[in-house]
Interface confidence: low
C-alpha cells in the first residue's frame, strides 16, 4: 500500500501503522531500546517485523493482536487498541473504508481518483496520501454521508456507493463531553435549544424540515432525541429548529473551560486536515531553527528523523548530534537553503517546510537580483542551472532526464557503489539525491537512479542565462498572512 | 479584500489596477506577459471601447501612485467567446519588466487545483472595515472542491466546472467589490501560478459562502491562442 495503514487485518501480524500507546494509555518502549525492559524481539533479531520506533507490532503472531513493551517498569508489555480495517464493510460514514467496491449505487463504474477524465476534480491522491484514494474504489474524503466516487459517465459527476455496514461495534471516537470543547464534535450533552431560543427538531424527524442529518446516515454521531450535535464539521453544535421559518441554528453550549461561550465567540476552526499556518519563522538558512513545525510547503507531514520509513536516510540524530533532529520537526542539518524534512508520503522523499524567514520588522526587503557568475566551472552555482559541464552545479534537481528519481549519494540501494560518495568526494556537493557531476563528465550532471535496472543517468539541467525576472517569482517575499 | 492583511509592497508584482481613463480604480487584473492582462469579462461591461480603460502596474497605493508606477493604455479587448467571465486586454505598449512588475505564470491546460490547496487573493477592493483600504491587500484562502462548494448549505449547485471556489466556510475573509478581475494565485514548487480570476460571490466574506473564481486552466488554450494571433 502506498500509505501507512492505521488499521489491522486479522490479528495484525502485518500491521505497520504508528500507534505507540497501549490500550491502557501507556507509551510504548522503543523496540531498539533495552530500558526499562530487555526485549526478546528487536529490529536486530527480527528485521522483517517492522519493529520501528515504538510502534505497536505483532512479531510473534499473538492472537490478541499488536502489542509493545511499555515504558512502565512495572508492566513489561501490553496490547494496543488498533482499529479493524474496513475492507468488507464500513463503520460510521465510511471515512476509513478501505475496500474495493468501485460501483456507485446506480451501478455506474467509478472513475479512478488519479484520473481527470471524464470529470476534472480536486481530490488528487498525491495531495491526500492519508485519504487512501486508491484506484477507482469508493472513498469518503470530504465528510459525505458515505463513500462515493466520480463516475465514468460524463453526465453524472459523482454518486454515492452502497457499502454494507459493519456488524461489529464502531471504533471509539475518543472522549466525549457534556460541555463545549473545540467545535463540539464530541459534545454529548442534552442542550436542545438554539441561540435564539428555538426548540430543536428531533434528528429522526423530517418535519418541519426535511434533511439528511439522520441517525441512520450518521450512526457514530449520537444524534439522540433533539439534542444539539455537530455531526458534519460545522463551527459548533447545532440543530434543525421546530420553527418552519428557521431551518437550523447553532446552540449555546457551556464551554468546558467554565466560561459560557456564545456562538459569536466560537473561534471558527479550520476544517480537519487543512495545513495549519505555522506562525514561527527561521533566521538565515534556518540551521538554528528549533521550532516545532512539522508540515511541508505542500501540507505533507514530516517523517521522524530517527525513522527509516517510508524513506531510508543518513540524516539521523546520531549522525548530526547538534542539528536538533528531534521528533519529526523541520530542521536544516545540512546547510540547505531552509528547514526541510523527509515526508511521510512514500512518493515524495523530502520537501522544504511551511515556514517563513523571520523579518526583523514588517518592512519588506527587496531581494537583490541573482548574481551572474562568469562561466568558471569550478565555482559552485546555487541556481538551478549550470555553467559549462556543470561540475560546479549545486542546484536541487533530483530526477533524471527520464523523470526517474535519483538515489541518495549516501545510499547503497538499489545500487551499491563506492567511488562517488559524500565521504570519498567531500567537496563535490554529493548532498541528498541531487544531480551532480563529481567526475566532470562531458554529459553534465548525473546521478545513480532509483530504478534497479538503471545504474545511472544524466539529468536535465539547463545552462544558466543572464538574470531575468521569471514569471510567478516575486523579488519581494510575500507576507502570506493567514486568511483569518 | 475583506480580512487578510496589507501586502508587502511589490510582493505581488503581477497585480494590475484596471482604471477608467480618468484614473478611477474599478477592477483588478493580472499581468500574464509584457503585453497582456487577464481580467474578468464583467469588468469590461461598461464600455466596449479599449480607449475607456488604462492599466496601472507596479503600484502599492491605490491613489498616491509611486514614481516607478507604469501607466499603460489598452489597445484591444478580447472577451471569451462562450461568455464566461474572463477577458484579455492587449496593452498599447509592452510593460517594462522590473523587480516591481513581473508576470504571473499560467497553469498547464485543464490543470485542477487540489481541494484545500492554500492560495492567495490580492486587490484594492472593498475591505468592509477590515483595515488596509487604499493599499494592496492579500489573503490566504483554501480552494474548496466544486463538489463540496455546490452542497445545499454552501453555493447550492451554482458553481460551474469552469469555476472554482475558495474561502473559509466560517467567513471573515474574501475578495469583494473592486477585487473583481484580480488574481487568485497558488504556489507550486518554486513559483506562483494564476489559477483563478476573481468573479463573483454571494455578498463578501459571509459564512458558508465562499468566493467564486474563473478556473484559468480551462481557458489557457484560448488565452494562448489570442496572444499568439494578436
Amino acid at each position: 500500500k502506498v500509505y501507512l495503514s492505521e488499521c489491522k487485518t486479522g490479528n495484525g501480524k502485518n500491521y505497520r501503522g504508528t500507534m505507540s500507546k497501549t490500550k491502557n494509555g501507556i507509551t510504548c518502549q522503543k523496540w531498539s531500546s533495552t530500558s526499562p525492559h530487555r526485549p526478546r524481539f528487536s529490529p536486530a533479531t527480527h528485521p522483517s517485523e517492522g519493529l520501528e520506533e515504538n510502534y505497536c507490532r505483532n512479531p510473534d503472531n499473538d492472537p490478541q493482536g499488536p502489542w509493545c513493551y511499555t515504558t512502565d517498569p512495572e508492566k513489561r508489555y501490553d496490547y494496543c487498541d488498533i482499529l479493524e480495517c474496513e475492507e468488507e464493510c464500513m463503520h460510521c460514514s465510511g471515512e476509513n473504508y478501505d475496500g474495493k467496491i468501485s460501483k456507485t449505487m446506480s451501478g455506474l463504474e467509478c472513475q479512478a481518483w488519479d484520473s481527470q477524465s471524464p470529470h476534472a476534480h480536486g481530490y488528487i491522491p498525491s495531495k491526500f496520501p492519508n485519504k487512501n484514494l486508491k484506484k477507482n474504489y469508493c472513498r469518503n474524503p470530504d465528510r459525505e454521508l458515505r463513500p462515493w466516487c466520480f463516475t465514468t459517465d460524463p453526465n453524472k459527476r459523482w454518486e454515492l456507493c452502497d457499502i454494507p455496514r459493519c456488524t461489529t461495534p464502531p471504533p471509539s471516537s475518543g472522549p466525549t463531553y457534556q460541555c463545549l470543547k473545540g467545535t463540539g464534535e464530541n459534545y454529548r450533552g442534552n442542550v436542545a435549544v438554539t441561540v435564539s431560543g428555538h426548540t430543536c427538531q428531533h434528528w429522526s424527524a423530517q418535519t418541519p424540515h426535511t434533511h439528511n442529518r439522520t441517525p441512520e446516515n450518521f450512526p457514530c454521531k449520537n444524534l439522540d432525541e433533539n439534542y444539539c450535535r455537530n455531526p458534519d464539521g460545522k463551527r459548533a453544535p447545532w440543530c434543525h429548529t421546530t420553527n418552519s421559518q428557521v431551518r437550523w441554528e447553532y446552540c449555546k453550549i457551556p464551554s468546558c473551560d467554565s466560561s459560557p461561550v456564545s456562538t459569536e465567540q466560537l473561534a471558527p476552526t479550520a476544517p480537519p486536515e487543512l495545513t495549519p499556518v505555522v506562525q514561527d519563522c527561521y533566521h538565515g538558512d534556518g540551521q538554528s531553527y528549533r521550532g516545532t513545525s512539522s508540515t511541508t510547503t505542500t501540507g505533507k507531514k514530516c517523517q521522524s528523523w530517527s525513522s527509516m520509513t517510508p524513506h531510508r536516510h543518513q540524516k539521523t540524530p546520531e549522525n548530526y548530534p547538534n542539528a536538533g533532529l528531534t521528533m519529526n520537526y523541520c530542521r536544516n542539518p545540512d546547510a540547505d537553503k531552509g528547514p526541510w524534512c523527509f515526508t511521510t508520503d512514500p512518493s515524495v522523499r523530502w520537501e522544504y517546510c511551511n515556514l517563513k524567514k523571520c523579518s526583523g520588522t514588517e518592512a519588506s526587503v527587496v531581494a537583490p537580483p541573482p548574481v551572474v557568475l562568469l562561466p568558471d566551472v569550478e565555482t559552485p552555482s546555487e541556481e538551478d542551472c549550470m555553467f559549462g559541464n556543470g561540475k560546479g552545479y549545486r542546484g536541487k534537481r533530483a530526477t533524471t532526464v527520464t523523470g526517474t528519481p535519483c538515489q541518495d549519494w549516501a545510499a547503497q540501494e538499489p545500487h551499491r557503489h563506492s567511488i562517488f560518495t559524500p565521504e570519498t568526494n567531500p567537496r563535490a556537493g554529493l548532498e541528498k539525491n541531487y544531480c551532480r557531476n563529481p567526475d566532470g563528465d562531458v554529459g553534465g550532471p548525473w546521478c545513480y537512479t532509483t530504478n534497479p535496472r538503471k545504474l545511472y543517468d544524466y539529468c536535465d539541467v539547463p545552462q544558466c542565462a543572464a538574470p531575468s525576472f521569471d514569471c510567478g517569482k516575486p523579488q519581494v517575499e510575500p507576507k502570506k498572512c493567514p486568511g483569518r | 479584500v475583506v480580512g487578510g492583511c496589507v501586502a508587502h509592497p511589490h510582493s505581488w508584482p503581477w497585480q494590475v489596477s484596471l482604471r477608467t481613463r480618468f484614473g478611477m480604480h474599478f477592477c483588478g487584473g493580472t499581468l500574464i506577459s509584457p503585453e497582456w492582462v487577464l481580467t474578468a469579462a464583467h469588468c469590461l461591461e461598461k464600455s466596449p471601447r479599449p480607449s475607456s480603460y488604462k492599466v496601472i502596474l507596479g503600484a502599492h497605493q491605490e491613489v498616491n501612485l509611486e514614481p516607478h508606477v507604469q501607466e499603460i493604455e489598452v489597445s484591444r479587448l478580447f472577451l471569451e467567446p462562450t461568455r464566461k467571465d474572463i477577458a484579455l486586454l492587449k496593452l498599447s505598449s509592452p510593460a517594462v519588466i522590473t523587480d516591481k512588475v513581473i508576470p504571473a505564470c499560467l497553469p498547464s491546460p485543464n490543470y485542477v487545483v487540489a481541494d484545500r490547496t492554500e492560495c492567495f487573493i490580492t486587490g484594492w477592493g472593498e475591505t468592509q472595515g477590515t483595515f488596509g483600504a487604499g493599499l494592496l491587500k492579500e489573503a490566504q484562502l483554501p480552494v474548496i472542491e466544486n463538489k463540496v462548494c455546490n452542497r445545499y448549505e454552501f453555493l447550492n449547485g451554482r458553481v460551474q466546472s469552469t469555476e472554482l471556489c475558495a474561502g473559509h466556510l466560517a467567513g471573515g475573509t474574501d475578495s469583494c467589490q473592486g477585487d473583481s478581475g484580480g488574481p487568485l494565485v497558488c504556489f507550486e514548487k518554486d513559483k506562483y501560478i494564476l489559477q483563478g480570476v476573481t468573479s463573483w460571490g454571494l455578498g463578501c466574506a459571509r459564512p458558508n459562502k465562499p468566493g467564486v473564481y474563473v478556473r484559468v486552466s480551462r481557458f489557457v488554450t484560448w488565452i494562448e491562442g489570442v496572444m499568439r494571433n494578436n
Epitope: - | H42, N150, S161, W200, L202
Partner: nanobody, 122 residues
C-alpha cells in the same frame, strides 16, 4: 433591473408538447439560477422546474419524466420542454431568475416574468 421575456405558451391537446423559453436582459448581472413556476386559477404559485448555473436541475414530482428544463448560459435563456401534457398542467407559467449584480453587493435578487398562458384541452 433585469427584464424577462417569456414565449411559447398556447393551447394544446392533451398528450401534446410545448416549449417555453425565457430570456433575461438588463444591467450588468450574472444569472445563478433560472426556473419556471406555474399558477392555476385559485391555486398557490408552485415550482415546476429550476436549473442552476452549475447545471443542477430540480423538478416538481408531478412533472418528473415529462418536462425537461435546460439553459443556455451564453444567452441567459432558460427553456422548458413540456411533453405528454395533461389538462391539470393548465396554468400561467412564470419565468424566474436569481441574479447577482456585478456592481452591487453580491446579494442574490429574484426576478419574475409577466407569465405565459398554457392551456391543455382534453
Amino acid at each position: 433591473q433585469v427584464q424577462l421575456v417569456e414565449s411559447g405558451g398556447g393551447l394544446v391537446q392533451a398528450g401534446g408538447s410545448l416549449r417555453l423559453s425565457c430570456a433575461a436582459s438588463g444591467r450588468r448581472f450574472m444569472v445563478v439560477a433560472m426556473g419556471w413556476y406555474r399558477q392555476a386559477p385559485g391555486n398557490q404559485r408552485e415550482l415546476v422546474a429550476s436549473i442552476t448555473n452549475g447545471g443542477t436541475t430540480n423538478y416538481a414530482g408531478s412533472v418528473k419524466g415529462r418536462f425537461t428544463i435546460s439553459g443556455d448560459s451564453a444567452k441567459n435563456t432558460v427553456y422548458l420542454h413540456m411533453n405528454s401534457l395533461k389538462p391539470e398542467d393548465t396554468a400561467v407559467y412564470y419565468c424566474t431568475t436569481d441574479v447577482v449584480f456585478r456592481d452591487g453587493n453580491g446579494q442574490i435578487q429574484s426576478n419574475w416574468g409577466q407569465g405565459t398562458q398554457v392551456t391543455v384541452s382534453s
